[in-house]
Amino acid sequence: MKVLQEPTCVSDYMSISTCEWKMNGPTNCSTELRLLYQLVFLLSEAHTCIPENNGGAGCVCHLLMDDVVSADNYTLDLWAGQQLLWKGSFKPSEHVKPRAPGNLTVHTNVSDTLLLTWSNPYPPDNYLYNHLTYAVNIWSENDPADFRIYNVTYLEPSLRIAASTLKSGISYRARVRAWAQCYNTTWSEWSPSTKWHNSYREPFEQHHHHHHHHHHH
């Protein structure tokens, strides 16, 4: 039994780091393998992660962590019974994939304005709480070409757009994801999408132009 692709890990910079690797053949990850991890710090105990299968020869392990600081470094040991298959280390701050934002809501009760709000996925004591920026994706369920991205580069988890920038009388969906420049993170996963029916009263003189819209990237 050998490791074909060494473990690579990403951290949510709060409580979970996820490591994935591939073996050289079909493996029952949970019964045959164990990933031991230990913070390089005083008093730290070794923890055992039981991997799950991720495709025939792939394994994935979710490492639970109480907290995280920038300087953290973990030792990783992959065992098959008494045999050490691989030894490595992992610095969570260098491989961050933020948690996905949640609670995306579209408020349509403001006259001719759409207000999208969502929740920051981190508590205030986490460094990323004040360092996330967001991308909001809005698309039409009726027209695949009507797809746009709004970059939210301020800290407030909200976006205001004029309802008239979208077509009236059709349904739209929105979703949001996050990243943090400070740790050069990857993008988070998208939040669950939310749906609303876009309707607004157009001034008569704009009526013939309501199909025009801009794509934002």
């Epitope: 709060m14 409580s15 979970i16 390089v40 710090f41 005083l42 008093l43 109480d66 907290d67 600081v69 920038s70 300087a71 953290d72 981190y122 508590p123 205030p124 004591d125 460094y127 004040n130 400070c182």
Partner: antibody, heavy 116, light 112 residues
Framework: EVQLVQSGAEVKKPGATVKISCKAS????????MHWVKQAPGKGLEWVGR????????IYASKFQGKATITADTSTNTAYMELSSLRSEDTAVYHC?????????WGQGTLVTVSS | DIVMTQTPLSLSVTPGQPASISCRSS???????????LEWYLQKPGQSPQLLIY???NRFSGVPDRFSGSGSGTDFTLKISRVEAEDVGVYYC?????????FGQGTKLEIK
């Protein structure tokens, strides 16, 4: 041996500023959060705030926002807390504590007395 | 802010007898990572506080097994199965789950 050694007692006049230090040995403060805890004479423990020494990220209890400023110097392995606009109610023992992720190591405390 | 309320505020116990201290939080102290950072500290006379229990039930290294922690949600308890003379001091519960972190007001244990 792990130790947090704090600076000595201070006596200050109302309105003054004081800066107390906490030097760590036996570990690197970059590997922990450094917290400060207040204990007024004959009273209980009160959390002031904390710093991540690597990036300088601080959070404070709202009561101490504007009163306390926590800093750290990773080159000397030392955390600091400055208390400004001192008043008699700031008279207390202030403890530095390392948390990873619980308060395992405490400094001996620094008594700050505010008196005219 | 989460208020941590300890009862009783003082306790007088005969050596060898059990003691129990309750700590109630004003709201849930489950952290967003799923853990409950409820800790117990003992401050002996003239000393800095020392850690006894972390994450509700875990004894810190070197802490005698006569100390135990229990509880969940908003109700937590520290028990000393047989009090010894060296256990005198003030016991504090602490929540490190939500900012601002908060201590209970303390329970003074003395020996009869």
């Amino acid at each position: 041996e792990v130790q947090l050694v704090q600076s000595g007692a201070e006596v200050k006049k109302p309105g003054a500023t004081v800066k107390i230090s906490c030097k760590a040995s036996g570990f690197n403060i970059k590997d922990t959060y450094m917290h400060w805890v207040k204990q007024a004479p004959g009273k209980g423990l009160e959390w002031v705030g904390r710093i991540d020494p690597t990036n300088g990220y601080t959070i404070y209890a709202s009561k101490f926002q504007g009163k306390a400023t926590i800093t750290a110097d990773t080159s000397t392995n030392t955390a600091y807390m400055e208390l400004s606009s001192l008043r008699s109610e700031d008279t207390a023992v202030y403890h530095c504590v390392s948390r990873r992720p619980w308060f395992a190591y405490w400094g001996q405390g620094t008594l700050v007395t505010v008196s005219s | 802010d989460i208020v941590m309320t300890q009862t009783p505020l003082s306790l007088s116990v005969t050596p060898g007898q059990p003691a129990s201290i309750s700590c109630r939080s004003s709201q849930s102290i489950v952290h967003s990572n799923g853990n409950t950072y409820l800790e117990w500290y003992l401050q002996k006379p003239g000393q800095s506080p020392q850690l006894l229990i972390y994450k509700v039930t875990n004894r810190f290294s070197g802490v005698p097994d006569r100390f135990s922690g229990s509880g969940s949600g908003t109700d937590f308890t520290l028990k000393i199965s047989r009090v010894e003379a060296e256990d005198v001091g003030v016991y504090y519960c602490f929540q490190g789950s939500h900012v601002p972190y908060t201590f209970g007001q303390g329970t003074k244990l003395e020996i009869k």
